[in-house]
């Protein structure tokens, strides 16, 4: 049975050309966490696989960088950031948990900055 | 540039066991991931496994658990793949390939090395 | 195990046709795959990934597009060279699989 949970940052906000942190958290589970995979709607942004490292989709390599930990570092942003970021967390034996971020990317210094997870 | 060289063919007996290798040179052999894949004669393609030459670490396709060792000697840039209890079924070619930068997708092929298990 | 599946195991092309040569996955792979041509004799080579993604020094008659678990691989005018199998495969999870491969044969 599948006990663990995602915590997430959940809803945050960052300046356009900013920086933010996409950051999860997988907790009540002793499951070994074999890759973690970040994804928007249609397409992959990285993967980092335990054994293997960090793989970054092309669209993203200028401008992603991995870490802190299994997190992500999304770097340059622009409004079209806006939107939802997934976490895939690949877990043996429990299988796969997927937690959900909503980043706003908002044009003007009204960006908040309370967000646990997020580069001042 | 980069290379990879492999031996073209070993011959090798039933339940013996075969290291093959594979030279990695026109690049920093620790920084990417090197990868092997099985062909069976006409066949298609079949991943094994990876290995993280910094630190060793490897990644195995469940099916080859038992039968493939990776490992790598960075003092000669080279990764090495062990196949033991060998059996008909383990006559193919081998190909050891590496990665992009930041990528796993295969960006370099070896020219593969012919495995024939035969009395 | 993520099944990468190529409806096709051959298609017969004539030279400056446009081919195109679908796989779909068993699960959801987003944007995690590559297509490979391998030439009769010869290692597999890399052309398209990530899946759109054109590699260095790969004509631009070679294209790939889709998301999620479908995904196609075209050629826009297929030349005399281009006689080759042709797979997809998957990195979104280990094993990474390939699809079966799909023959291209020149009328």
């Known amino acids: 049975m599948m006990t663990g949970t995602i915590e997430t940052t959940g809803n945050i906000s960052a300046e356009k050309g900013g920086s933010i942190i996409l950051q999860c958290h997988l907790s009540s589970t002793t499951a070994q966490v074999t890759q973690v995979n970040w994804e928007q709607q249609d397409q992959l942004l990285a993967i980092c696989n335990a054994d293997l490292g960090w793989h970054i989709s092309p669209s993203f390599k200028d401008r992603v960088a991995p870490g802190p930990g299994l997190g992500l570092t999304l770097q340059s942003l622009t409004v079209n950031d806006t939107g939802e970021y997934f976490c895939i967390y690949h877990t043996y034996p429990d299988g796969t948990y997927t937690g959900r971020i909503f980043l706003e990317v908002l044009e003007s210094s009204v960006a908040e900055h309370g967000a646990r997870f997020q580069i001042p | 540039q980069v290379q990879l060289q492999q031996p073209g063919a070993e011959l090798v007996k039933p339940g013996a066991s075969v290291k093959l290798s594979c030279k990695a040179s026109g690049y920093t052999f620790i920084s990417y991931n090197i990868y092997w894949v099985k062909q069976r004669p006409g066949q298609g393609l079949e991943w094994i496994g990876g290995v993280n030459p910094s630190n060793g670490n490897t990644n195995f396709n469940e099916n080859f658990k038992s039968k493939a060792t990776l490992t790598v000697d960075k003092s000669s840039s080279t990764a090495y793949m062990q196949l033991s209890s060998l059996t008909s079924d383990d006559s193919a070619v081998y190909f050891c390939t590496r990665g992009n930068y930041y990528g796993y997708e295969f960006a370099y092929w070896g020219q593969g090395t012919l495995v024939t298990v035969s009395a | 195990d993520i099944v990468m599946t190529q409806s096709h195991k051959f298609m017969s092309t004539s030279v400056g046709d446009r081919v195109s040569i679908t796989c779909k996955a068993s699960q959801h792979v987003s944007t995690a795959v590559a297509w490979y041509q391998q030439k009769p004799g010869q290692s597999p080579k890399l052309l398209i990934y990530s899946p759109s993604y054109r590699y260095t020094g790969v004509p631009d008659r070679f294209t790939g597009s889709g998301s999620g678990t479908d995904f196609t691989f075209t050629i826009s005018s297929v030349q005399a060279e281009d006689l080759a199998v042709y797979y997809c495969?998957?990195?979104?999870?280990?094993?990474?699989?390939f699809g079966g491969g799909t023959k291209l044969e020149i009328k």
């Open positions: 495969q998957q990195h979104y999870s280990t094993p990474w699989t």
